[in-house]
């Protein structure tokens, strides 16, 4: 059993998060998961899920009585998630720390919106996909 | 040229992100996303990036003298990002609007934790290939 | 070409009011959408308020409601944002924008700053 599972338990009672009720009016993200096969879709939205997640955390990271568990939880989806690569995780953590505020960070992004859309498409990579796609366009 | 070409341009005009100097000490986006060269990886960095710049826009939506620009921008990153896939951008921006301090969602979210975790490595989605996996380690 | 020239600015107790005017060259401000942005010291672009070209929309930010007023002088060309109420949060270089022709401007501001 991987360890994080005894730790979440640990969670449920802390969050008094166990209890059937928990789950009336839907899922937060299980359902979400359940639409997206492949595996593209599946990390844009697990992206989303495992920020939420460390913010969620981030909350609580003076919280003694729990600490233990949501390390190791984290250091769980560090493997699973970025695949125990460091600076994945890094690079993530950057990005999901940005302020929409701050001067410096507003003009950067407006600064290099045009070539954050221009990589947005996966055909947008190398010019050589793209051609082959053209030619598949008939 | 794409239509959100222009219209980022007049952003840059709007958040005076026009000048060379707004480069300096480094890029958010652009770096990042030179490090990752696999899609999947890909799509977990461009899913925070892609997150940043709706937040963003989300402060100027009734900015009239920018509605437009943040308009077609947004569709276009609907059509590059989400494929023009309009459950995709739902189920993104459910996930995106969920607050980490509301505490039936902490409860929902622990309560799926174990499954979510469960989820998070591309191995796990079905048994078959797990096990396939493993008979590549010996 | 469009011109976009702020002014009004200054320092303002707490309580106070002031109003900001913007003079507009090369379009006619009746026919646009124009609105007021702000940008406190050491932070990013905030938008403060709008108002469509037929004047019946009108918008503000919740930080200014109830406070700003953005209104438009057409025979003299002017969009005006009255400020009451300030506070020094409300400490900031205000600029107007508009749209003209598919093209965004934007003034070179005037400081207004809250300060007892």
């Known amino acids: 059993q991987d360890p994080y599972v005894k730790e979440a338990e640990n969670l449920k009672k802390y969050f008094n998060a166990g209890h059937s009720d928990v789950a009336d009016n839907g899922t937060l993200f299980l359902g979400i998961l359940k639409n997206w096969k492949e595996e593209s879709d599946r990390k844009i939205m697990q992206s989303q899920i495992v920020s939420f997640y460390f913010k969620l955390f981030k909350n609580f990271k003076d919280d003694q009585s729990i600490q233990k568990s949501v390390e190791t939880i984290k250091e769980d989806m560090n493997v699973k998630f970025f695949n125990s690569n460091k600076k994945k995780r890094d690079d993530f953590e950057k990005l999901t720390n940005y302020s929409v505020t701050d001067l410096n960070v507003q003009r950067k992004a407006i600064h290099e919106l045009i070539q954050v859309m221009a990589e947005l498409s996966p055909a947008a990579k190398t010019g050589k996909r793209k051609r082959s796609q053209m030619l598949f366009r008939g | 040229q794409d239509p959100y070409v222009k219209e980022a341009e007049n952003l840059k005009k709007y958040f005076n992100a026009g000048h060379s100097d707004v480069a300096d000490n480094g890029t958010l986006f652009l770096g990042i996303l030179k490090n990752w060269k696999e899609e999947s990886d890909r799509k977990i960095m461009q899913s925070q990036i892609v997150s940043f710049y709706f937040k963003l826009f989300k402060n100027f939506k009734d900015d009239q003298s920018i509605q437009k620009s943040v308009e077609t921008i947004k569709e276009d990153m609907n059509v590059k990002f989400f494929n023009s896939n309009k459950k995709k951008r739902d189920d993104f921006e459910k996930l995106t609007n969920y607050s980490v301090t509301d505490l039936n969602v902490q409860r929902k979210a622990i309560h799926e934790l174990i499954q979510v975790m469960a989820e998070l490595s591309p191995a796990a989605k079905t048994g078959k290939r797990k096990r396939s996996q493993m008979l590549f380690r010996g | 070409q469009v011109q976009l020239q702020e002014s009004g600015g200054g320092l303002v107790q707490p309580g106070g009011s002031l109003r900001l005017s913007c003079a507009a060259s090369g379009f006619t401000v009746s026919n646009y959408a124009m609105s007021w942005v702000r940008q406190p010291p050491g932070k990013g672009i905030e938008w403060v308020s709008s108002?469509?070209?037929?004047?019946?929309?009108?918008t503000y930010a919740d930080s200014v409601k109830g406070r700003f007023t953005i209104a438009r002088d057409n025979a003299n060309n002017i969009l005006y944002l009255q400020m009451n109420s300030l506070k020094p949060e409300d400490t900031a270089v205000y600029y107007c924008?508009?749209?003209?022709?598919?093209?965004?401007?934007r003034g070179q501001g005037t400081q207004v700053t809250v300060s007892s």
């Open positions: 924008a508009s749209r003209v022709d598919d093209r965004v401007s």
């Open positions: 108002i469509n070209n037929r004047n019946d929309h009108i």
